[in-house]
């Protein structure tokens, strides 16, 4: 069972004073880290106990493995049921705690009730302050039964639950018909899922017969021993004041676990702590009593004392339970009360006793669950103590459970009872993840989904490249970390599995599956340095660059042109995309920027030294276009144009460019400077005879501006052949400029 | 679906007796508190007589004390009145009903005439 | 002589609201939130419409409300419609040793 306890302070004099505190024995509790499972939970449940809302409720953790809830503030903010939630995955318990308050009408004799499938549980509720009117009885909060005030028995309300069954189990209510549900009597009933003594799926097994009040789990068999008790079977009492699956912890303050109510997993629910009784576990035993809730007797024989917390402290020469065995009578000796091992393996385990007359090796057995008997093949012995060896056939999951250490003599005979667990070495049901790779290295996380049992102990990694026939790499490495595999080959494929391992012999799982996990091309090393640039318009950068030469062929797929743009904070990246390309046209820039530019050669996703950066300023953008362009034929070798100026100049125009091209004609259209820049009128001369032409223009101040629109005139008929357009300029008149 | 089905009643004479019935379904009768309630013609409600999970436990209206008789039987889910020494005034639809959790008449059964006639 | 005093009758038009009251004594409905009432259409058995003082169990329409002062409780219906005419009758615990629960004498609902 999961080692949590729900310990509830009962000194209920200040209700501010109140506190639950969970706390968990298990390794790594309550961190809530992925690597040890989800925290601590400590809530108050209002599904079946609804209280008035009063301000929320303190939670305070201490440390990874407790967690207190605090802040109560009237004695109505106690009553109900209260629940800690601890362990991860499948062992996830939660521990319940019911709470009662001391001034209800009715009061439960016993809180929790604990029984078998089958038996008859009773339900018994104290009149403590009487009202003369029906009794609800509520299961789960809905509606279960009634009694008259005339039935109540000895000032006592008894429900009778006959051939109680698992779904029965729950949380139970006394209420006098229109009392306050604050005045009720709140119950906790457990219905363990099998017979008396049984435990199983099928309930075939026995359980171990818990000892000191211990309460046999119906699916584990174990034993959930009271506060104050360990071992398998409960039979050993831990010192005053401590509690825990191993006595690991210790009550709070100087009273020790006085007005402390424990609760612990099903089916054993809440009691006081060992050596206290009374409803706020407050008063001591009486003489000749002890353990948790004083329940048990000591009955001490051959002079032994009782001991509240303990039981009966035997007299030298005398041991057991009531003092009742001889030290003369055989005992077995410090057996462990659970041993761990792997499936498969085969395992030696011993067996020491000791006794007058003295064992001999013929005289130990070894009882496995299934009733087969092993003998031991070999004894040591000692002057105090006999230790038979047993060889223990490979083991099967079904040998789990408990086996028993028998020795008989002539004095009498002794056996001791253990716990076997039987482990499946995880196997992994995943492969491993590849988190980053580079030519040479992968970097892997190796822990994944597994089947069988933890904890795992070491991760191996097992790898070498696909298709290969060659022995496998291994590494082994932490559970908790990733692994970098290195001194891979580049681009080449390798088949990667995981093997993990649990603790002890035979721990070694199988391989988990295989994964394909690539490694990267190999770097580009070399560095281009930029032969030059320049610039082809206001947004137009033309770059050069070149390698070194290196023999060999070019490990590279292309090149990555890198702009910067250092006054807005903005990069431009270009990919060109040939590892032969030395040159590269850089469009739709911003005019008038200056940017930093370089270059590297790029492999797969991989990327080689950048060139050193060079400084680019580009021109900034250029005037308006030129407005009213107008084209009238003046001969059949002559046409003349108009324009008016660009609007909102940014300053004085140097030029205008003019272009000229046949209309429908298929060649480079042809370039004219008018280099008078106040002139708004152009002859273009040498045109030919009956020919259309379309013409558009534009500015330059310290850049080419935006073109104008498009004009399209034919030039008059019947002229020769002209050897190309030229142009004459003057300023319009005032009769033109329409 | 819970379901009272009386039956039992009839005509009778002044100090006669008649046994009614009631059988109960749809829900555990062993839990509940259950009440025999009359209706005279043309009147209203008047409680009867109640009895208790167990059976231990019964009440009865002053005006039918010491005549009538409640009791039930777990094992069958059936619930009985006894009426003996009836008079002219026992004349009523008789009908059973579960108290439910709220404490009310949760389920009525579809009643059954008593007349008590000469 | 019922213990619980009801009006013999009420009447109101379709969609009004009407109350219908039951005044006991600090034996019964004083005593406990235990108020109930049922409605009871000719030759049908009872149906349960209110307990615990306003409580209304599951499928009552809730036009029908309930509501306590003092040692008297009230029946209220509001969007009166043609089916609500019946009789309505409202119970309640009692501490007097002879009476387990007490009946009104039942009022007669008519819708105009």
């Known amino acids: 069972a999961v080692d949590l306890t729900l310990l509830a302070n009962l000194r209920l004099t200040d209700p501010q004073r109140f506190f639950l505190t969970c706390v968990s024995g298990e390794a790594g509790a309550g961190r809530g880290s992925d690597a040890w499972g989800p925290p601590l939970l400590l809530e108050k449940d209002d599904r079946i106990v609804r209280t008035p809302p009063g301000p929320p409720l303190r939670l305070a953790r201490n440390g990874s493995h407790q967690v207190t809830l605090r802040g109560f503030s009237k004695p109505s903010d106690l009553v109900g049921v209260f629940s800690c939630v601890g362990g991860a995955g499948a062992r996830r318990t939660r521990v319940i705690y019911v709470h009662n308050s001391p001034g209800a009408h009715l009061l439960p004799d016993k809180v929790t009730h604990t029984v078998n499938k089958g038996d008859t549980a009773v339900l018994s509720a104290r009149v403590h302050k009487e009202k003369q009117t029906d009794v609800i009885w509520k299961s789960n909060g809905s509606y279960f039964y009634t009694l008259d005030w005339h039935e109540a028995q000895d000032g006592r309300f008894l429900l009778q639950l006959p051939n109680v069954q698992p779904p029965s189990s729950g949380i139970y209510s006394a209420t006098y018909l229109e009392a306050s549900p604050l005045g009720s009597a709140f119950f906790r009933l457990i219905v363990r899922g099998c017979g008396a003594g049984r435990w199983g799926p099928g309930c075939t097994k026995e359980c171990p017969g818990c000892l000191h009040g211990g309460v046999c789990h119906d699916h584990d068999g174990e034993c959930v021993c009271p506060p104050g008790f360990t071992g398998t079977r409960c039979e050993q009492a831990c010192r005053e004041g401590r509690f825990g699956q191993s006595c690991q912890e210790q009550c709070p303050g100087i009273s020790g676990c006085r007005g402390l109510t424990f609760c612990l997993p099903d089916p054993y629910g809440c009691s006081c702590g060992s050596g206290w009784r009374g409803s706020q576990c407050q008063e001591a035993c009486a003489p000749g009593h002890f353990g948790a809730d004083c329940r048990l007797q000591c009955q001490c024989q051959n002079g032994g004392t009782c001991d509240r917390f303990s039981g009966c402290v035997c007299p030298s020469g005398w041991h057991g339970v009531h003092c009742e065995k001889s030290d003369r009578i055989p005992q077995i000796l410090n057996m462990a009360s659970e041993l761990e091992f792997n499936l498969e393996t085969m395992p030696r385990i011993n067996c020491a006793a000791a006794g007058n007359p003295f064992p001999v090796r013929g005289s130990i057995e070894l009882r496995k669950p299934d009733g087969t008997v092993l003998l031991s093949t070999k004894a040591i012995v000692e002057p105090e103590k006999t230790t038979a060896e047993f060889e223990v056939p490979r083991l099967v999951l079904a040998d789990s459970g408990f086996w028993e250490c028998r020795v008989s003599t002539s004095g009498g005979q002794d056996s001791r009872r253990f716990k076997v667990n039987v482990k499946v070495p995880p196997v992994p049901l995943a492969a491993p993840r590849l988190l980053t790779k580079q030519s040479r290295q992968l970097v892997v996380s190796p822990l994944v989904s597994f089947s069988g049992d933890g904890p795992i102990s070491t991760v191996r990694l097992h790898y070498r490249p696909q298709d290969s026939t060659m022995d496998w790499s291994t590494i082994v490495v932490d559970p908790s970390e990733n692994v970098t595999l290195m001194n891979l080959r580049p681009k080449t494929g390798y088949s990667v599995r995981v093997q993990l391992s649990r603790p002890g012999e035979g721990g070694e799982g199988a391989w988990g599956p295989p994964t394909l996990m690539t490694t990267d091309c190999p770097e580009p090393l070399l560095q281009p340095w930029l032969e030059g640039w320049h610039v082809e318009g206001t947004d137009r950068l033309r770059v050069s660059w070149s390698l070194p030469l290196v023999p060999g062929p070019l490990v590279g797929d292309g090149f990555l042109l890198r702009l910067w743009d250092g006054t807005r904070g903005q990069e431009r990246r270009e990919n060109v995309s040939s590892p032969q390309a030395r040159t590269a046209l850089l469009t739709g820039l911003t005019p008038g920027t200056h940017y930093q530019l370089d270059v590297q050669l790029y492999h797969c996703t991989l990327l080689g030294p950048a060139s050193p950066p060079a400084h680019v300023l580009l021109p900034p953008s250029g005037p308006p276009a030129p407005r009213h362009l107008h084209a009238q034929a003046l001969s059949d070798s002559e046409i003349q144009l108009t324009w008016k100026h660009p609007e909102a100049l940014p300053g004085p125009i140097s030029k205008y460019v003019v272009e000229v091209q046949v209309a429908g004609g298929a060649g480079d259209p042809l370039w004219i400077d008018v280099d008078r820049p106040e002139e708004t009128s152009t002859i273009i001369r040498g045109l030919n005879a009956s020919t259309r032409y379309l013409f558009r223009m534009r500015a330059s101040i310290q850049g080419l501006g935006d073109w104008s629109n498009t004009v399209e005139e034919s030039t008059l008929g019947n002229g020769l052949q002209a050897e190309g357009p030229v142009q004459e300029s003057r300023a319009a008149e005032e009769g033109l400029d329409q | 679906e819970v379901q009272l089905l009386e039956s039992g009643g009839g005509l009778v004479q002044p100090g006669g007796s008649l046994r009614l019935s009631c059988a109960a379904s749809?829900?555990?009768?062993?839990?509940?508190?259950m009440y025999w309630v009359r209706q005279a013609p043309g009147k209203g409600l008047e409680w009867v007589s109640v009895?208790?999970?167990?059976?231990?436990?019964?009440y009865y209206a002053d005006s039918v004390k010491g005549r009538f008789t409640i009791s039930r039987d777990n094992s069958k889910n059936t619930l009985y009145l006894q009426m003996n020494s009836l008079r002219a005034e026992d004349t009523a639809v008789y009908y059973c009903?579960?108290?439910?959790?709220?404490?009310?008449?949760?389920?009525w059964g579809q009643g059954t005439l008593v007349t008590v006639s000469s | 002589q019922s213990v619980l005093t009801q009006p013999a009758s009420v009447s109101g038009s379709p969609g009004q609201s009407i109350t219908i009251s039951c005044t006991g004594t600090?034996?019964?409905?004083?005593?406990?939130?235990?108020a109930s009432w049922y409605q009871q259409r000719p030759g049908k058995s009872p149906k349960l419409l209110i307990y615990?003082?306003?409580d209304r169990p599951s499928g009552v329409s809730n036009r029908f409300s309930g509501s306590k002062s003092g040692n008297t409780a009230s029946l209220i219906i509001s969007g009166l419609q043609a089916e609500d005419e019946a009789d309505y009758y409202c119970?309640?615990?009692?501490?007097?040793?002879?009476?387990?629960?007490?009946f009104g004498g039942g009022t007669k609902l008519s819708v105009l």
């Open positions: 009903a579960r108290r439910g959790s709220s404490g009310a008449f949760d389920y």
């Open positions: 749809g829900f555990t009768f062993s839990r509940y508190v």
């Open positions: 009895i208790y999970p167990s059976g231990g436990a019964t």
């Open positions: 600090s034996s019964d409905i004083g005593r406990y939130n235990y």
């Open positions: 615990e003082v306003s």
């Open positions: 119970s309640s615990y009692s501490s007097t040793n002879s009476l387990q629960v007490v």
